[in-house]
Amino acid sequence: EKLPKAPVITTPLETVDALVEEVATFMCAVESYPQPEISWTRNKILIKLFDTRYSIRENGQLLTILSVEDSDDGIYCCIANNGVGGAVESCGALQVKMKPKITRPPINVKIIEGLKAVLPCTTMGNPKPSVSWIKGDNALRENSRIAVLESGSLRIHNVQKEDAGQYRCVAKNSLGTAYSKLVKLEVEVFARILRAPESHNVTFGSFVTLRCTAIGIPVPTISWIENGNAVSSGSIQESVKDRVIDSRLQLFITKPGLYTCIATNKHGEKFSTAKAAATVSIAEWSKSQKDSQGYCAQYRGEVCDAVLAKDALVFFNTSYRDPEDAQELLIHTAWNELKAVSPLCRPAAEALLCNHLFQECSPGVVPTPMPICREYCLAVKELFCAKEWQAMEGKAHRGLYRSGMHLLPVPECSKLPSMHRDPTACTRLPYLDYKKENITTFPSITSSRPSADIPNLPASTSSFAVSPAYSMT
């Protein structure tokens, strides 16, 4: 009769490498008497005998995983016990190896120039795959703008037009290589005006061609606005070459106007717009008009009706063919530009513009316009509209095309007379006199001369000169 013998594992478990969907086997050879009972664990959890993913044979000495999954990674142990001595255990690891697999491939992207683009490429695999990218037929090189992230995604900072093209990601490890499908990166560019229309001073009845050139991706469309409305007459010719659109507006000039070229292109649901404007003025064509620069008349327009004094006489400049229409058109265009400014700036700017374009008028042998007081002009520009003014001047200094407030017919404050010097020489903006916290609308803002309660200082101590060279802008 055999003597009882405690179990001894004669072939300890080893690390097993297996590919996904392949078979993996652990062998646990045991010598003992009587025959031992062998159980198996994975990560210290007992493997049930009836689990169909496993096959346990040779009295429990062979554990086979029939189709390896990546979740089967772990430590496997066999435990042998026959009641003689203690139970014995041997453990080994299963390392699931996996060919590269792209789990989140890149997709087609449309991106606006200057923004950041990220093309995803999430991978699986063991060993962890390295990810590289191909653009067109060539390997993509990383630089200060272009980087492959830890996740495998491709990040492009400050996207440029030349970044457009076809991309694919490549995942590679020691077991193989996976390629994504080709995806397209399209770079869109905001509409930008390359050549602004030029202003013209022409004689009545002349033909003028205004030219506006714009670029963008997609190619922009160009529309023309005359004094705030769609151009009512004239012919437009357009040509497109290399994403540049060239538009020429030919006009027969019978009145002065402000012509705005608007270039627009679409980016998804949004539009980008660039504007440039030019004035067409009519040269004075008779000596009598040269001698008389304007006349006084009641304001009969609509735009400044709430701002100007009721029944006030205002100055109309006869350097325009039809002064009342021309000045009304200019203020109408200015009004549209003011839609973009802040609520603090807008009413102050409206008061300034109306009183500047329609100056209070002293009738007489020579009708004389009365300019705004420099103090009010400064307050509007540098206090109420400070942000708008700085933004505008900053763009001008950098040579960028200016939009918005630069189109407004604004006076140059330093050329205006001071209200402190001669209260009757300039016009106040009573908008600024109002106690604003008590007022929500300004239905009857009227202009007025400074009242005589401001003393005229003696000439020896206060000799500010009133600028005679003031003229309409």
């Epitope: 402190h420 106690k435 604003k436 916290e437 401001i454 101590t461």
Partner: antibody
Framework: QVQLVQSGAEVKKPGASVKVSCKAS????????MHWVRQAPGQGLEWMGI????????SYAQKFQGRVSMTSDTSTSTVSMELSSLRSEDTAIYYC??????????WGQGTLVTVSS | DIQMTQSPSAMSASVGDRVTITCRAS??????LAWFQQKPGKVPKRLIY???NLQSGVPSRFSGSGSGTEFTLTISSLQPEDFATYYC?????????FGQGTKLEIK
């Protein structure tokens, strides 16, 4: 950016005159008026007068009439304030300031004038 | 000349308090009043222009109101950095005139 740089501190004897200068930069010098304001030690602000650098016209507070003179030099973008017949109560910090009430205000760093026998 | 009278000339308050400073003009100056803050050894800084408009960059706890001859500067919730001297300035006519100042101290 706009800067107003004033001349250095001065110590004067009673009866003497002092001239404080204020050099402007970062803007069109002739487009803005310049004020002079002073502050005696531990006291409040006192408006002295104003100059239009374009042409040099001035307006002074009554208190300083006859003793103060403000001038401008467009070639160097500098305004100056001269105060004569100094007395001990003229000891103060003198500031130049651009457009106090109506436009964007900018101040010089101040010049201490000490009047002492 | 227009006289500007500020009250109080000095006051003490605690952080979080609501503070009101008044400025009276000897004649109508419309809205043409500015408020300045000055800290020891520093140049004055404008807080409010044309009576009720907050200078760009100034915290919204400062507000101004009034027209004609009566004006107020209000600090809705006093902060440690608000302890300073405050001046009003009329710029309706020459000569411009400052109020005598209000020194705001920590209680």
């Amino acid at each position: 950016q706009v800067q107003l740089v004033q001349s250095g501190a001065e110590v004067k004897k009673p009866g003497a005159s002092v001239k404080v200068s204020c050099k402007a930069s970062g803007y069109t010098f002739t487009s803005y008026y310049m004020h002079w304001v002073r502050q005696a030690p531990g006291q409040g602000l006192e408006w002295m007068g104003i100059i239009n650098p374009s042409g040099g016209s001035t307006s002074y507070a009554q208190k300083f009439q006859g003793r103060v003179s403000m001038t401008s030099d467009t070639s160097t973008s500098t305004v100056s304030m001269e105060l004569s017949s100094l007395r001990s109560e003229d000891t103060a910090i003198y500031y130049c300031a651009r457009e106090l009430g109506w436009g964007s205000d900018y101040w010089g760093q101040g010049t201490l004038v000490t009047v002492s026998s | 000349d227009i006289q500007m009278t500020q009250s109080p000339s000095a006051m003490s308050a605690s952080v979080g308090d609501r503070v009101t400073i008044t400025c009276r003009a000897s004649q109508d100056i419309r809205n043409y009043l500015a408020w300045f803050q000055q800290k020891p050894g520093k140049v004055p800084k404008r807080l409010i222009y044309i009576a009720s408009n907050l200078q760009s960059g100034v915290p919204s706890r400062f507000s101004g109101s009034g027209s004609g001859t009566e004006f107020t500067l209000t600090i809705s919730s006093l902060q440690p950095e608000d302890f300073a001297t405050y001046y009003c300035l009329q710029h309706n006519s020459y000569p411009y005139t400052f109020g005598q100042g209000t020194k705001l101290e920590i209680k």
